[in-house]
Amino acid sequence: MAVTACQGLGFVVSLIGIAGIIAATCMDQWSTQDLYNNPVTAVFNYQGLWRSCVRESSGFTECRGYFTLLGLPAMLQAVRALMIVGIVLGAIGLLVSIFALKCIRIGSMEDSAKANMTLTSGIMFIVSGLCAIAGVSVFANMLVTNFWMSTANMYTGMGGMVQTVQTRYTFGAALFVGWVAGGLTLIGGVMMCIACRGLAPEETNYKAVSYHASGHSVAYKPGGFKASTGFGSNTKNKKIYDGGARTEDEVQSYPSKHDYV
């Protein structure tokens, strides 16, 4: 049960995380005009990865897309690339993890295949989360650098008579959404990897052992119990008798090589 819960929770957390990464990537408020210690203006500027916007004091907002590719800063292009890679990996990870979910039955898929898929999706979520965190952090670093540069040159003018106030930008909401979403995707990925360990059938070194109990015929083979779920490595090796109802994840004692002398 714990494995299913861990896998399911990992999937949900990653799903929320990837939705957050997509939202952050699409948001316009990656950087917002710094209002602290600045003259109050009738306009408010904010910028995203794809367009910049100006909101008048009336609330009327006008946005302009960045219709150039070559004219954009390399750092912005890098952030875009990281976010898109994060989204693509996350989306593929979600697709893979849906089929890997223990609670979903697809034909006669083996447990080892589910375990592998869970691990694959987990790794994809981890990389996706790291991409998002890296992208957001690169952008944040760019903002901090520009902020202090514009603070140093805040007032430039002709003989101090005419002043030009440079618009300074600070962290926008999208950065925080991106950090949280990237973190959630990362956590979801780790949970999937942990779940994978519980899903993988245990490798045993002994050969199949058979014994006859009076009145009952029970054939034990490695992976025998798992086979009863219909997901096992060999569906022909189903346990003929199960002495009591058990849940799929309940601990099953396998015969140890030390049990037979």
Partner: antibody, heavy 119, light 113 residues
Amino acid sequence: QITQKESGPGILQPSQTLSLTCSLSGFSLSTYFIGVGWIRQPSGKGLEWLAHIWWNDNKYYNTALKSRLTISKDTSNNQVFLKIASVDTADTATYYCARMGSGAWFTYWGQGTLVTVSA
Amino acid sequence: DIVMTQSPSSLTVTAGEKVTMSCKSSQSLLNSGNQKNYLTWYQQKPGQPPKLLIYWASTRESGVPDRFTGSGSGTDFTLTISSVQAEDLAVYYCQNDYYYPLTFGSGTKLEIK
């Protein structure tokens, strides 16, 4: 047709509170991005912005007069009000009410109302 | 507060002449976000309220004759009337609509010979 008509007391004494009303027609105060402002002009002098209010109740005041100014609106009656506390003779002017554009400029002006502060 | 300085304070021209008047602001009115200059020009004829002519430094309000042209960027702005008509007799004001408090210039009085 967009019109705005200002009304005021005409004459009042120093230290009293000046109450001005701007009655609007041709547009609604609840419409997105609509704003109404007050500007005054002493006789033969220049224009001075006092305050304005937006459709979403955002208010902006002239910092030099902020402590004495109160702007408000009554959306149902399509009216904007301005109160100026503790008036003195320097407040004698023609007071204009104006509708604002999407930005902080004034697109349509009323005819103005002359207010005289006299002892 | 932003100081708006208009020059000349008055000028007298003959009908049909080209006229230019200047407005300077103590700080740049150019918004980096949209590259627009937040400066507005008004015309106030004797005994009338002001009338909007130009906003965003160069965008003519609908119904304003095309002989009125606004130009300039940053801190220096100009209003040009290409061919003055008798009805252009008025005081022209510029307004900073970028920084609060909103401020007006002292005006340029245009007189016709």
